[in-house]
């Protein structure tokens, strides 16, 4: 019994003066509470709880279920209480068989016994199977087994509470343990898409999926810089016991251009938190924009090849491509391709082959492309570069030696004597006339140039050479002149290509 | 005290079947689990399977699956244990186990042997 | 497939003291468990939970784990304590028993 100061308020006086009373079911309990500023009994097992206003608490006929802790409260608030124990051999167990433990944690299977003197009193797999090696708990008669730091692997355990009387083992009824896991880690956000590009009217939905132990991880859709609270859907599944996602759709039934921003999935737990962020572009109509992957103005060598390439951006997506030239279709020699699988991808590729050019085959080559709501279309100016071709070398009869020469680039033509014999003709002569002709073929063919020189400048027999060149080679004529007195015999022409 | 005993000697041909039984005594039958457990001869012990006497669920090892049946008959405490179209390797002797602590007890063994 | 590995014989001579050994992969996280076969065919578990020792079994019999090895010792031996003896534990989410191969005692 408590110590009593003098002038000090005491704690009440409870008979029998004992802390633990044991009794036999069907006995009397009779507890008596002596304190001049009684106010109340109150008796708590599990989560019952009665009180009484009479200073002496008399149950006639006890029963297992009057086990419990009974305590006398007065005016002061200050308070004793005495553990009754009601043994009745058929109920050796009371019991609440909710059991729920956090991860990590202690909890508290409750079967507090109604006799305190059974022995090993303990926890026991049900069927007899083992519990789990790294399970430790306490017991405690009065309150239950304590689970101590429940871990993940217990979820689902089943379990009794289990005393020997009389050398034999008596369970109590079966407990499974529930877990309620702790967040370790923060959650797993995604996102369905990582960018959209819509027109006005259109319908913009995207899905972000969350994923943790537990259904208590809290998630919104949140825009970027502004506070206003969207509208969202849920879908959620367990995928076993710490497996948990949920979906959350974000719908807008008919973006408009003001719509457009970044959108961010927020999710967070008692560990932390984790976002994801889509982009969403409105435009009020389609588009396409081409890119050329090399000079719009293409320079190449007869007989070689070339590849005109284009990148271009459509959204909606391209409908018809198509390549012209001369206003012919390319029905093959072309391919056209997505630049990438991503399902976001707006850019795409074009690729025209061109093989083995030919001098007539320089001009304007065209790629167009349309969608639903816009055309477009890039041309590249291709010139076939050709080494000079000499057309025509002739005396007039003027006098004049005449040397027409086509090829692209534009062909220079240099004149040159040779005396007498002499294989090299290194003196130079400066044409009389230099003209360029408008070419009767398309434009970007060969450019012709024609040069002429006096003959009668020319006072000894020789070879006079005409040497038309440019970038890509050159080309020689030669006329051979001989003297009879002072007569010029004839003059002969004849080519000899350089390579 | 807990006891578990099990059914006589059986001699079979090949293809017939066999039942045989494991009675529970000075326990709650529905308390604890009854295992089954095969020794062939010159063997070691291979457990086989056991069965929930709360609800009657059996839980097998892979090669017990198929030919063998285990059931209860809670009210008399029994558990049984059928095989089917036995073979000459079904030769052995199958013990029953139960208890506290899964096989806290064991019954004597039944011995099966199968020859034509 | 998981095993539990014991040795297939061991010999004590009259009154020392001899340990059996049981390896399993999953033993640093499952119990053990010890059982005692005699010539008979009778079984009896002397070892439960990894060193618990049932009513009725002689003191003289204990058993310890370490990491991945199970251990019965067993101090005195007896005549009476040849026998073969078999450790049991459980593997997998599902903690199906599963037995080792047994030890063959001879008391010398």
């Known amino acids: 019994q408590p110590s009593v100061s003098p002038g000090e308020p005491s704690p009440p006086s409870i008979h029998p003066g004992k802390s633990d009373l044991i009794v036999r079911v069907g006995d009397e309990i009779r507890l008596l509470c002596t304190d001049p500023g009684f106010v109340k009994w109150t008796f708590e097992i599990l989560d019952e709880t009665n009180e009484n206003k009479q200073n002496e608490w008399i149950t006639e006929k006890a029963e297992a279920t009057n086990t419990g802790k009974y305590t006398c409260t007065n005016k002061h608030g200050l308070s004793n209480s005495i553990y009754v124990f009601v043994r009745d051999p058929a109920k050796l167990f009371l019991v609440d068989r909710s059991l729920y433990g956090k991860e990590d944690n202690d909890t508290l299977v409750r079967c507090p016994l109604t006799d305190p003197e059974v022995t090993n009193y303990s926890l026991k797999g049900c069927q007899g199977k083992p519990l789990p090696k790294d399970l430790r708990f306490i017991p405690d008669p009065k309150a239950g087994i304590m689970i101590k730091s429940v871990k993940r692997a217990y979820h689902r355990l089943c379990l009794h509470c289990s005393v020997d009387q009389e050398g034999k083992s008596v369970l109590s009824e079966k407990f499974i343990l529930k877990v309620r896991p702790a967040f370790k880690a923060v959650p797993v956000v995604s996102v369905s898409k990582a960018s959209y590009l819509l027109r006005e009217g259109e319908e913009f939905t995207v899905t972000c999926t969350i994923k943790d132990v537990s259904s208590s991880v809290y998630s919104t859709w949140k825009r970027e810089n502004s506070q206003t609270k969207l509208q969202e859907k849920y879908n959620s599944w367990h995928h076993g016991d710490f497996n948990y996602e949920r979906q959350a759709t974000l719908t807008i039934s008919s973006a408009r251009v003001n719509d457009s921003g970044v959108f961010m999935c927020y999710a967070n737990n008692t560990f932390g938190s984790a976002n994801v962020t889509t982009t969403l572009e409105v435009v009020d109509k389609g588009f396409i924009n081409i890119f050329p992957m090399i000079n719009t103005t293409v320079f190449v060598n007869d007989g070689e090849n070339v590849d005109l390439i284009v990148e271009y951006e459509a959204f909606p997506k391209p409908e018809h491509q198509q390549w012209i030239y001369m206003n012919r279709t390319f029905t093959d020699k072309w391919e056209d391709y997505p630049k990438s699988e991503n399902e976001s991808n707006i850019r795409y590729v074009s690729e025209l082959h061109l093989t083995r050019l030919k001098g007539t085959e320089g001009g304007t080559y065209t790629f167009l492309v349309s969608n639903s709501d816009v055309n477009a279309a890039i041309a590249f100016n291709v010139y076939v570069n050709t080494k000079p071709e000499i057309l025509t070398y002739d005396r007039l009869v003027n006098g004049m030696l005449q040397c027409v020469a086509a090829g692209f680039p534009e062909p220079t033509i240099d004149w040159y004597f040779c005396p007498g014999t002499e294989q090299r003709c290194s003196a130079s002569v400066l044409p009389v006339d230099v003209q360029t002709l408008n070419s009767s073929g398309p434009p970007f063919g060969k450019l012709v140039v024609q040069s002429s020189i006096d003959s009668s400048a020319f006072k000894h027999n020789g070879t006079v050479e005409c040497k038309a060149y440019n970038d890509v080679g050159k080309t020689s004529a030669y006329f051979n002149f001989a003297f009879k007195g002072n007569n010029k015999e004839q003059i002969h022409p004849h080519t000899l290509f350089t390579p | 005290q807990i006891q578990l005993v099990q059914s006589g000697p059986e001699l079979k041909k090949p293809g017939e079947s066999v039942k045989i039984s494991c009675k529970a005594s000075?326990?709650?039958?529905?308390?604890?689990?009854i295992h089954w457990v095969k020794q062939a001869p010159g063997q070691g012990l291979r457990w086989m399977a056991w069965?929930?006497?709360?609800?009657?669920?059996?839980t097998y090892a892979d090669d017990f699956k198929g030919r063998f049946v285990f059931s209860l008959e809670a009210s008399a405490s029994t558990a049984h244990l059928q095989i089917s179209n036995l073979k000459n390797e079904d030769t052995a002797t199958f013990f029953c186990?139960?208890?506290?602590?899964?096989?806290?007890?064991w019954g004597q063994g039944t011995l099966v042997t199968v020859s034509s | 497939s998981y095993e539990l590995i014991q040795p297939p014989s061991a010999s004590v001579t009259l009154e020392n003291t001899v340990s059996i050994t049981c390896s399993g992969d999953?033993?640093?996280?499952?119990?053990a468990h010890w059982y005692q076969q005699k010539p008979d065919k009778t079984i009896l578990e002397v070892i439960y939970n990894d060193s618990e020792r049932p009513s009725g079994i002689s003191d003289r019999f204990s058993g310890s784990s370490s990491g991945t090895t199970a251990i019965l010792t067993i101090r005195d031996a007896q005549a009476e304590d040849e026998a073969d003896y078999y450790c049991l534990s459980t593997f997998s989410d599902d903690d199906l028993p599963i037995f080792g191969g047994g030890t063959k005692l001879t008391v010398l």
């Open positions: 999953e033993l640093s996280n499952k119990y």
């Open positions: 069965i929930n006497t709360e609800t009657g669920k059996p």
């Open positions: 186990a139960g208890g506290s602590h899964w096989f806290a007890y």
């Open positions: 000075g326990y709650t039958f529905t308390d604890y689990a």
